[in-house]
C-alpha cells in the first residue's frame, strides 16, 4: 500500500520537526501523485509523439474527463469550500475508471501506474473525511464504468496512445487545480 507522502516521500519535502496538519498532509499527498504522473508522462512522451500531436481534439471527443470550471466554486472569485470539495471528490471518483484503464498501458512504469491509482484512492478517503456534504457526491455507476473501460480498450493503437496521453494531462491539471483550491480550505 502506498505510504503517506510527507512522511516518506524524498522528492516532495524536507523532513518535518513537527507533525503536519491535515491540509499539509493532503498537499504533500497530491504532490506525490503528481510526481507519479510526471514519470508516466515521460514514458508516454518517449515512446510516441502524442505529446506534440495537434490531433488531440479527435480523441478528446470520446472522453469526458473532469475539469475545473469557475462554477465549481474552486476559483478565487466565488470560492465556496463545500461546493469545491464536492467537485474535487466527484472528479477524483470519475477519474478512477481512467486510472484503471492506465494500468495495462505501461511497461517500465507499471508500478508507478499502480501507485498513482492507489494513492488516488487514499486521497479520496482523506477528502471524504474532510467533506461535510457527502450526500452531494455522486459516485459513477459500476456498469457505466465497465462499459467505458471496454470501449476504451477496444480502440486502435493510435487512439489508445492518445487516450493515455490525454488522461495523464487532464489528471495532472485537475490535481493542480485541487492543490490550489485545497490550500484555501
Amino acid at each position: 500500500a502506498p505510504v503517506l507522502p510527507g512522511e516518506d516521500s524524498k522528492n516532495v519535502a524536507a523532513p518535518h520537526s513537527q507533525p503536519l496538519t491535515s491540509s499539509e498532509r493532503i498537499d504533500k499527498h497530491i504532490r506525490y501523485i503528481l510526481d507519479g504522473i510526471s514519470a508516466l508522462r515521460k514514458e508516454t512522451c518517449n515512446r510516441s509523439n502524442m505529446c506534440e500531436s495537434s490531433k488531440e481534439a479527435l480523441a478528446e471527443n470520446n472522453l469526458n474527463l473532469p475539469k475545473m470550471a469557475e462554477k465549481d466554486g474552486c476559483f478565487q472569485s466565488g470560492f465556496n469550500e463545500d461546493t469545491c470539495l464536492v467537485k474535487i471528490i466527484t472528479g477524483l471518483l470519475e477519474f478512477e475508471v481512467y486510472l484503471e484503464y492506465l494500468q495495462n498501458r505501461f511497461e517500465s512504469s507499471e508500478e508507478q501506474a499502480r501507485a498513482v491509482q492507489m494513492s488516488t484512492k487514499v486521497l479520496i478517503q482523506f477528502l471524504q473525511k474532510k467533506a461535510k456534504n457527502l450526500d452531494a457526491i455522486t459516485t459513477p455507476e459500476p456498469t457505466t464504468n465497465a462499459s467505458l473501460l471496454t470501449k476504451l480498450q477496444a480502440q486502435n493503437q493510435w487512439l489508445q496512445d492518445m487516450t493515455t496521453h490525454l488522461i495523464l494531462r487532464s489528471f495532472k491539471e485537475f490535481l493542480q487545480s485541487n492543490l490550489r483550491a485545497l490550500r484555501q480550505m
Epitope: 519535502a13 524536507a14 518535518h16 510526471s38 475545473m68 491539471e173 492543490l179
Partner: antibody, heavy 122, light 107 residues
Framework: QVTLKESGPVLVKPTETLTLTCTVS??????????VGWIRQPPGKALEWLAH???????RYNSALKSRLTISKDTSKSQVVLTMTNMDPVDTATYYC??????????????WGQGTLVTVSS | EIVLTQSPDFQSVTPKEKVTITCRAS??????LHWYQQKPDQSPKLLIK???QSISGVPSRFSGSGSGTDFTLTINSLEAEDAATYYC?????????FGQGTKVEIK
C-alpha cells in the same frame, strides 16, 4: 530559456492609472500549474506581492490593494497586464513580474523580470 | 497575515566566513518557506525552496533548514559575489509575504 520583461510608463501623475505589461518567453501562460505574479519594491525597502494570475485564469490579489488592482492575460501574445488605479507617490517602486507555480503549483517565484521603476509625481 | 521577521537586518562579514540568517514566522508555515538573493540593482533570484531544497545552478555553499516557525539560511564560505540582500518568503498562505531583508556586506 525563460525570460520575463516588464514594460510601461516610468512616470505617472497622482490619481492616474498605471498599466504595466509583462511579456514572457520560454514557457506558455496556458501550461497547467503555471502563472505570473507581480511584486513591487519601493526604493530601499522590502518586496511586496501584489497579484498573480494562473494558467486557467484564476486570479489572486493582495487584499490591502485589491480595490485598485486588475490582472489579466493574453495567452496568444504571452502577455500579462496589471493595472493599478489612483496612483499615489507612495506607490513609487520598482515593479517586477515573475513566473510562479510549476508541477506543484508552487507559491514561489522562480524567474523574475529585470523590473521597471515607476515614479509617481506631479 | 503571516509576518516574517529576519535577523539580523545587516551583517558585515569577511570572505570565507560562515553566514547565518534567520527568519521567524508569526505562525507555523510547515516547510513552505523560500529564500531569495537580491544583488544591488538586480532583480531577486530564487536560492532555496521549501525551507531546504536546493535550486539548480545555485552554488552548494547556500543551504536552508527549519520547519514550522523558525528557518535558517546558511552561506558556508562567503564569497565576494555573495554581497546582497536576502529575503525569506511565506509560500504557505495568502497574502504571500516577505521578510524585511538581511543585507550582507563584505568586509
Amino acid at each position: 530559456q525563460v525570460t520575463l520583461k516588464e514594460s510601461g510608463p516610468v512616470l505617472v501623475k497622482p490619481t492616474e492609472t498605471l498599466t504595466l505589461t509583462c511579456t514572457v518567453s520560454g514557457f506558455s501562460l496556458s501550461t497547467s500549474g503555471m502563472g505570473v505574479g507581480w511584486i513591487r519594491q519601493p526604493p530601499g525597502k522590502a518586496l511586496e506581492w501584489l497579484a498573480h494570475i494562473w494558467w486557467d485564469d484564476d486570479k489572486r490579489y493582495n487584499s490591502a490593494l485589491k480595490s485598485r488592482l486588475t490582472i489579466s492575460k493574453d495567452t496568444s501574445k504571452s502577455q500579462v497586464v496589471l493595472t493599478m488605479t489612483n496612483m499615489d507617490p507612495v506607490d513609487t517602486a520598482t515593479y517586477y513580474c515573475a513566473r510562479i507555480g510549476g508541477l506543484y503549483v508552487d507559491y514561489l517565484m522562480d524567474y523574475w523580470g529585470q523590473g521597471t521603476l515607476v515614479t509617481v509625481s506631479s | 497575515e503571516i509576518v516574517l521577521t529576519q535577523s539580523p537586518d545587516f551583517q558585515s562579514v569577511t570572505p570565507k566566513e560562515k553566514v547565518t540568517i534567520t527568519c521567524r514566522a508569526s505562525q507555523s508555515i510547515s516547510d513552505y518557506l523560500h529564500w531569495y538573493q537580491q544583488k544591488p540593482d538586480q532583480s531577486p533570484k530564487l536560492l532555496i525552496k521549501y525551507a531546504s531544497q536546493s535550486i539548480s545552478g545555485v552554488p552548494s555553499r547556500f543551504s536552508g533548514s527549519g520547519s514550522g516557525t523558525d528557518f535558517t539560511l546558511t552561506i558556508n564560505s562567503l564569497e565576494a559575489e555573495d554581497a546582497a540582500t536576502y529575503y525569506c518568503q511565506n509560500g504557505h498562505s495568502f497574502p504571500w509575504t516577505f521578510g524585511q531583508g538581511t543585507k550582507v556586506e563584505i568586509k
